[in-house]
């Protein structure tokens, strides 16, 4: 399993990570208080056949070419979670893992 | 977490679970012993925003609305092994759970 | 340098009412939640409230609930604590402090005497 | 609400000492305790967040450990200038509470 890195310099057009910092400030949500901003990541780029493909279903798929079945895309096929303090609306300050929110790898399904 | 499940006659254009026999015979692979076929699933459709997100990092990309990133796509979101017997390759038949063979639910990310 | 300055501390008798005020420069303080802890005379600390950074949140303990109103201005970079029916037990020095994941920046305090 | 059971409540230490305050809390609280230094007459000071992240311009001879249940405050080695009380404090969930304290003082 692996992921191509890219930046705002790079020249790959192929399915890539790119680095996002989110500013929960920035979006006016002032019920999460910690981070303020955190290292979120984002899959950008084309997927040509087989390349980075996560699952071997994607390539079943392809072959079968059912219809109105799209191409592959470029999306995250790993991701880590991040703790946050957060108020939860019920007057209640709440410290939590919250799941899936940051992409350390992207693929093709 | 739910996904939609369409077959071929739907008019659904949201991102939806389809269902598709995968035909190894068909696809002439022969090394594959069991099973000649299964019910392997897909995902096509629209993902319109907020619909179907599977990860909050979907939600918070659109916001920042980074240089490149396209919408969510309709994928996989959930998924399972089959079991099958194969021909490895050297002359050794194999039997094993191979994993993501199975869409059971379609999302956007 | 972060500073935070609380005032309007002072004796008050029981039943009565007073507000604090915390000044705050050095930080961006409406980017910040922001917390008010006191700590009775010889005793340990125990959390009084927590106000979100645009002010929509706020959070407190039993002990204080329905009595006690915290607030900000933030365009006066102030943080307040309304305090009424005040108990006897209310005896502390209230301090204000900047909210992260912990409480991370602290002022040096405000006597509140609750006593008749 | 979250019980903080610090120990000891005090201790007396020569300066070069490696020092260990232990927190117990009520219930699992992941990795969210705070430790706190108090002198008297002063603020507390943040030292450590999120069980074992050092603030900002704390000396790396403070640190912090422990997940769940059972967490530590260690000083590797004592400097004169940390004699003083420390407490815990759990920010898993409101109402946030802390230690009733350590006293360090020199033996």
């Known amino acids: 399993d692996f992921g191509l890195d890219c930046d705002e310099h790079s020249t790959e057009s192929r399915c890539c990570r790119y680095p996002l910092t989110v500013d929960f400030e920035a979006f006016g949500w002032d019920w999460i208080i910690a981070p303020k901003r955190y290292k979120a990541n984002y899959c950008s780029g084309e997927c040509e056949f087989v390349f980075l493909q996560k699952y071997p279903h994607t390539h079943l798929v392809h072959q079968a070419n059912p219809r109105g079945s799209a191409g592959p895309c470029c999306t995250p096929t790993k991701m880590s979670p991040i703790n946050m303090l957060y108020f939860n609306g019920k007057e209640q300050i709440i410290y939590g893992k919250i799941p899936a929110m940051v992409v350390d790898r992207c693929g093709c399904s | 977490d739910f996904g939609l499940d369409c077959d071929e006659h739907s008019t659904e254009s949201r991102c939806c679970r389809y269902p598709l026999t995968v035909d190894f015979e068909a696809f002439g692979w022969d090394w594959i012993i069991a099973p000649k076929r299964y019910k392997a699933n897909y995902c096509s459709g629209e993902c319109e925003f907020v619909f179907l997100q599977k990860y909050p990092h979907t939600h918070l990309v659109h916001q920042a609305n980074p240089r490149g990133s396209a919408g969510p796509c309709c994928t996989p979101t959930k998924m399972s092994p089959i079991n099958m017997l194969y021909f490895n390759g050297k002359e050794q038949i194999i039997y094993g759970k191979i994993p993501a063979m199975v869409v059971d639910r379609c999302g956007c990310s | 340098e972060v500073q935070l300055l609380e005032s309007g501390g002072g004796l008050v008798q029981p039943g009565g009412s007073l507000r604090l005020s915390c000044a705050a420069s050095g930080f961006t303080f409406s980017s910040y939640a922001m917390s008010w802890v006191r700590q009775a005379p010889g005793k340990g600390l125990e959390w009084v409230s927590t106000i979100s950074s645009g002010g929509s949140y706020t959070s407190y303990p039993d002990s204080v609930k329905g009595r006690f109103t915290i607030s900000r201005d933030n365009s006066k970079n102030t943080l307040y604590l309304q305090m009424n029916s005040l108990r006897a037990e209310d005896t502390a020095v209230y301090y204000c402090?900047?909210?992260?994941?912990?409480?991370?920046?602290w002022g040096q305090g405000t006597l509140v005497t609750v006593s008749s | 609400d979250i019980q903080m059971t610090q120990s000891p409540s005090s201790l007396s230490a020569s300066v070069g000492d490696r020092v260990t305050i232990t927190c117990k809390a009520s219930?699992?609280?992941?990795?969210?305790v705070a430790w706190y230094q108090q002198k008297p007459g002063k603020a507390p000071k943040l030292l450590i967040y999120?069980?074992?992240s050092l603030q900002s311009g704390v000396p790396s001879r403070f640190s912090g450990s422990g997940s769940g249940t059972d967490f530590t405050l260690t000083i590797s080695s004592l400097q004169p200038e940390d004699f003083a009380t420390y407490y815990c404090?759990?920010?898993?969930?409101?109402?946030?509470?802390f230690g009733g304290g350590t006293k360090v003082e020199i033996k």
């Open positions: 402090a900047k909210q992260d994941y912990a409480m991370n920046y």
């Open positions: 404090q759990q920010h898993y969930s409101t109402p946030w509470t």
């Open positions: 219930q699992d609280v992941s990795t969210a």
């Open positions: 999120a069980a074992s």
